[in-house]
Amino acid sequence: DGPAGSWEQLIQERRSHEVNPAAHLTGANSSLTGSGGPLLWETQLGLAFLRGLSYHDGALVVTKAGYYYIYSKVQLGGVGCPLGLASTITHGLYKRTPRYPEELELLVSQQSPCGRATSSSRVWWDSSFLGGVVHLEAGEEVVVRVLDERLVRLRDGTRSYFGAFMV
Amino acid sequence: DGPAGSWEQLIQERRSHEVNPAAHLTGANSSLTGSGGPLLWETQLGLAFLRGLSYHDGALVVTKAGYYYIYSKVQLGGVGCPLGLASTITHGLYKRTPRYPEELELLVSQQSPCGRATSSSRVWWDSSFLGGVVHLEAGEEVVVRVLDERLVRLRDGTRSYFGAFMV
Amino acid sequence: DGPAGSWEQLIQERRSHEVNPAAHLTGANSSLTGSGGPLLWETQLGLAFLRGLSYHDGALVVTKAGYYYIYSKVQLGGVGCPLGLASTITHGLYKRTPRYPEELELLVSQQSPCGRATSSSRVWWDSSFLGGVVHLEAGEEVVVRVLDERLVRLRDGTRSYFGAFMV
């Protein structure tokens, strides 16, 4: 690697460092599809942004391979736990890769939020946060799923969200 | 951009990279004011530090614009849920900007921790964690609020805290 | 600092930047020892990796001093809360340093997950997430402890994990 090559590499790195990949996507009225698919997200309005990552049908799409800290929070809430709704909620981050047909679990939480209702109030709120570092190749995608998604509460993009940044 | 300019820029970047802005502030006896204001934090003792960010009256103050991963955890606890104390706790990170008169919600969680008391024990503990990437301009501030703050338990700076770092 | 020195420093920094220290360790069947020691982790299989950090008996070992965002999540679960099991769970990240004989609390959460059992189901699930920035010197170690660890549920490395990256 001659000086010129190193120089070019450094210039290149400086430019890429300026756009260290990062994204923060926010919950919106359209997030819950009821179709069994992943949650959908706002990518531009309010606090939402994409920088060096792209978005497609609920998925953050990696354009530059590397290690990423990925995270998601979902706001859960309800009045009691109606029959037919799972009393156990599963909130997870999953990877889609062209090299494998099924989604791969990355980070997952299970919670039993209905137990938070009290004798004086059947209303309950709970929150689930996930975050961790995973390696992602260019073209791979990460999605958020919540089962049962009917317990996810959306409002203004601050309570349920999904993001990532390269570390 | 001539080689000299690029060189200077790289040197500059190297120096600024050495102090990639970061902070971790910890809970202290003085954190809960009861005044309706944000929580206050320890900035120097123990695990607390400021590096490339400043602090003012509970707020982390941004000196260098950019995308930051901001986070906060609060330890909640109590004996039963006495009347008049909110059975729903709201824990949030909020932005103050000179360009707007009111605080802006960034990341928020609602929880119903009192439902964690059991028949055999009225004592309950719960924890709320928030983290996400937001864009902050120089001079903008981020604060933590908890309603009802009387349910926040402080001890040694490890259970309730507030931090950020540039991504 | 002459141009050559600066150049070397930049080349050095570029190389070190390529391996910005990071790690993500995952829960495994061997994680829970019942010995009173910290949780043990998978370091290589599946989603687990070490980059610029090393591992020893449950501990992430720092090789390069600096500020690190450290995190851990544990999946908790059970059927009721059997007598003799603490109704309060403590989940913490602790530092071991050659300069001090005892472990130092870094980030800690207390939860009362058994209260999540409902009248219709004694099964409960809960999750505890911790994350924050701490300064670590070369040779210092970070471990995860959960009391009572019998309530930690392990499966496939996605529900209980431990990681860090330099910020």
Partner: antibody
Framework: QVQLVQSGAEVKKPGASVKVSCKAS????????VHWVRQAPGQGLEWIGA????????SYNQKFKGRATLTADKSTSTVYMELSSLRSEDTAVYYC??????????????WGQGTLVTVSS | DIVLTQSPDSLAVSLGERATINCKAS??????????MNWYQQKPGQPPKLLIY???NLESGIPDRFSGSGSGTDFTLTISSLQAEDVAVYYC?????????FGQGTKVEIK
């Protein structure tokens, strides 16, 4: 300054009901609980229950559940304690008291002057 | 219910001397370093008056000759230098658990 002013003394027959009022002033009425405590002649203090005027939530000593009813009227900043099926052992001075908190620990920092309820045939 | 037992039932102390009242709970009333125990003073014909909350915090406007201590199940109210106006009945009260309960009272008189 904080004041709790109670209604006057009452004489009731066994089996009847009594409704004692407590008018609050000098603080934000909807931000504090109001508790009721009674004291039989020459005896100690006994907690009856509490009401949170902010939303009307109540908490009762099981001993009085079903007989005591606590309500709050935000428009007049007044709290009421109604005790039904009176018996002679309910003869006591009834106090209202404002509840404050230190974290989740409740204490009674201001008291009404008391209302003597006499149950006699 | 949590039972609070005060001792002694009555106490005669000389002016300027120390008065000590004890309160024992049937179970611990501690949580996370706080003790859910309060103390009140009641003079004849008057309502009770808050002196100490959460075991050791002095209510505003109360003279600092009053102090509270203790944790777990054993608590103490101390009047460091008894004054004539301190003649009254003193009650401990727990707020750890519903129903809130009071001790039976300790009568303090001048010797």
């Amino acid at each position: 300054q904080v004041q709790l002013v109670q209604s006057g003394a009452e004489v009731k027959k066994p089996g009847a009901s009594v409704k004692v009022s407590c008018k609050a002033s000098g603080y934000t009425f909807t931000s504090y609980n109001v508790h009721w405590v009674r004291q039989a002649p020459g005896q100690g203090l006994e907690w009856i229950g509490a009401v949170y005027p902010g939303n009307g939530d109540t908490s009762y000593n099981q001993k009085f559940k079903g007989r005591a009813t606590l309500t709050a009227d935000k428009s007049t900043s007044t709290v009421y304690m109604e005790l039904s099926s009176l018996r002679s052992e309910d003869t006591a001075v009834y106090y209202c008291a404002r509840g404050s908190y230190y974290y989740t620990s409740s204490y009674f920092d201001h008291w009404g002057q008391g209302t003597l309820v006499t149950v006699s045939s | 219910d949590i039972v609070l037992t005060q001792s002694p039932d009555s106490l005669a102390v000389s002016l300027g001397e120390r008065a000590t009242i004890n309160c024992k709970a049937s179970q611990s009333v501690d949580f996370d370093g706080d003790s859910y125990m309060n103390w009140y003073q009641q003079k004849p014909g008057q309502p009770p008056k808050l002196l100490i909350y959460t075991a050791s915090n002095l209510e505003s406007g109360i003279p600092d000759r009053f102090s509270g201590s203790g944790s777990g199940t054993d608590f103490t109210l101390t009047i460091s230098s008894l004054q004539a106006e301190d003649v009254a009945v003193y009650y401990c009260q727990q707020s750890y658990e519903d129903p809130f309960t009071f001790g039976q009272g300790t009568k303090v008189e001048i010797k």
